[in-house]
């Protein structure tokens, strides 16, 4: 969980769990007004090592729509367009949150839920495994 | 927002801006059990696009340590070792969502908030541009 | 002889903007990688930005992210630096240089003779 | 970000001097083949001009008196027999990785 000094100036929590339930404002507020995430839209298709966009759609969960990569190939993109063995397209994974309802359907409650997402792929040398 | 028809049985809110505040439970369910997120950790290093990971915390959010991939080049790496700037490292980043206290110190009042991370980094071909 | 020229620093407010020029001759601009390099007035040389040869791909240093924006034109064989948000801090000599070249040689070959940004109110 | 400590940040010498600058990077900016250490001289007033690139090559037109070496995390610059055009302040440059980073300076003064 997390433990900071109550403040008194802070909405009261009647809930017996606390600091295990919190109140969420789900008006979202976007960080990112100066980052235009549009720039890095075709990096999936100009990689060495390209994937393809796959929808993962939830309702039960929030967000409820999320984008999963999936390497296209198992080798990485040369230059002249063939794919070489010799190196390994891999996903790069990252552990994110989101929302899931509990129980179930309910709009107003909710569990924090970590979930692994593939975002893109790196092309990757292989480990070689030297025989003794 | 997220509109979902009202279970009956669903915990009651007396919330007036319902349902833009919910209830959420901070117990973390983790449903990357089956899947070990250490695979991947050598990425990072074995990458024709390798990074270094930054560790960028806050107390005020949640998770409060999120950690950021900086590409290591300008170029890609070569099998022999050397920076190609024939293409060049860029990060892959993803919009990821955190809980942001507010009011500020609050230990159970949050707002959602969405956030650009970079998860890693990928060697991308740069666009040409065809003079006509 | 290759001639790298700056021109569009002066004096400006905090959180005013600048948009610096570089015109290159004697070189092959579209074979560079193209950098902004800083000096403040008594220090040392700090990396500011640089451009690949596409001009679709660049990179800055962490202090001036979302503030600076650098842009090529190689029709005009001309380097830009749009920098907005100005600080105290952005104040020095600015220099256009060269980067990386389609050779993979990636050191600053060439530079120009800098011009001078004050950020002061 | 590498860190590039040059040593020593000023010193006096004398025309004819031998005189050695070193620069230690805070992690390899070697590969197998090269090293991305390069060195440049600047003049009060005066635009950065390089010297040595990639450690050890000497720059077209820059005298035979300049020369560079070293691998890894250790470089060094050498003048071997100083001249009174070379008074100046030498930076030390790594392009291995991003971001670009410079050494802090050393300037060579007159004794």
């Known amino acids: 969980g997390i433990a900071i000094p109550r403040n008194s100036g802070c909405p009261n929590s009647e809930d017996k769990n606390f600091p295990r339930t919190v109140m969420v404002n789900l008006n979202i507020h976007n960080r990112n007004t100066s980052t235009n995430p549009k720039r890095s839209s075709d990096y999936y298709n100009r990689s060495t090592s390209p994937w393809n966009l796959h929808r993962n759609e939830d309702p039960e969960r929030y967000p409820s729509v999320i984008w999963e990569a999936k390497c296209r190939h198992l080798g990485c993109v040369k230059a002249d367009g063939n794919v070489d063995y010799h190196m390994n397209s891999v996903p790069i994974q990252q552990e994110i949150l989101v929302l899931r309802r509990e129980p179930r359907h309910c709009p107003n409650s909710f569990r924090l839920e970590k979930i692994l997402v593939s975002v893109g792929c790196t092309c990757v040398t292989p480990i070689v495994h030297h025989v003794a | 927002g997220i509109a979902i028809p009202r279970n009956s049985g669903c915990p009651n809110s007396e919330d007036k801006n319902f349902p833009r505040t919910v209830m959420v439970n901070l117990n973390i369910h983790n449903r990357n059990t089956s899947t070990n997120p250490k695979r991947s950790s050598d990425y990072y290093n074995r990458s024709t696009s390798p990074w270094n990971l930054h560790r960028n915390e806050d107390p005020e959010r949640y998770p409060s340590v999120i950690w950021e991939a900086k590409c290591r080049h300008l170029g890609c790496v070569k099998a022999d070792g050397n920076v190609d700037y024939h293409m060049n490292s860029v990060p892959i980043q993803q919009e990821i969502l955190v809980l942001r206290r507010e009011p500020r110190h609050c230990p159970n009042s949050f707002r959602l908030e969405k956030i650009l991370v970079s998860v890693g980094c990928t060697c991308v071909t740069p666009i040409v541009h065809h003079v006509a | 002889e290759v001639q790298l020229v700056e021109s569009g620093g002066g004096l400006v407010k905090p959180g005013g903007s600048l948009r610096l020029s570089c015109a290159a001759s004697g070189v092959i601009f579209s074979d560079y990688y193209m950098a902004w390099v800083r000096q403040a007035p008594g220090k040392g040389l700090e990396w500011v930005a640089s451009i690949n040869f596409n001009a679709d791909i660049s990179y800055y240093r962490e202090s001036v992210k979302g503030r600076f924006t650098i842009s090529r034109d190689d029709s005009k064989n001309t380097l830009y630096l749009q920098m907005n948000s100005l600080k105290t801090e952005d104040t020095a000599v600015y220099y256009c240089?060269?980067?990386?070249?389609?050779?993979?040689?990636?050191?600053?070959?060439?530079w120009g003779q800098g011009t001078l940004v004050t950020v002061s109110s | 970000a590498i860190q590039l400590t040059q040593s020593p940040s000023s010193l006096s010498a004398s025309v004819g001097d031998r005189v050695t600058i070193t620069c230690k990077a805070s992690?390899?900016?070697?590969?197998?083949?090269?090293?991305?250490m390069h060195w440049y001289q600047q003049k009060p007033g005066k635009a950065p001009k390089l010297l040595i690139y990639?450690?050890?090559n000497l720059e077209s037109g820059v005298p035979s008196r300049f020369s560079g070496s070293g691998s890894g995390t250790d470089f060094t610059l050498t003048i071997s027999s100083l001249q009174p055009e070379d008074f100046a302040t030498y930076y030390c440059?790594?392009?291995?990785?991003?971001?670009?980073?410079f050494g802090q300076g050393t300037k060579v003064e007159i004794k």
């Open positions: 990639r450690a050890s």
């Open positions: 240089t060269t980067d990386a070249n389609r050779q993979n040689y990636d050191w600053f070959a060439y």
């Open positions: 992690e390899s900016v070697s590969s197998s083949m090269y090293s991305y």
């Open positions: 440059q790594q392009s291995w990785t991003a971001p670009r980073t």
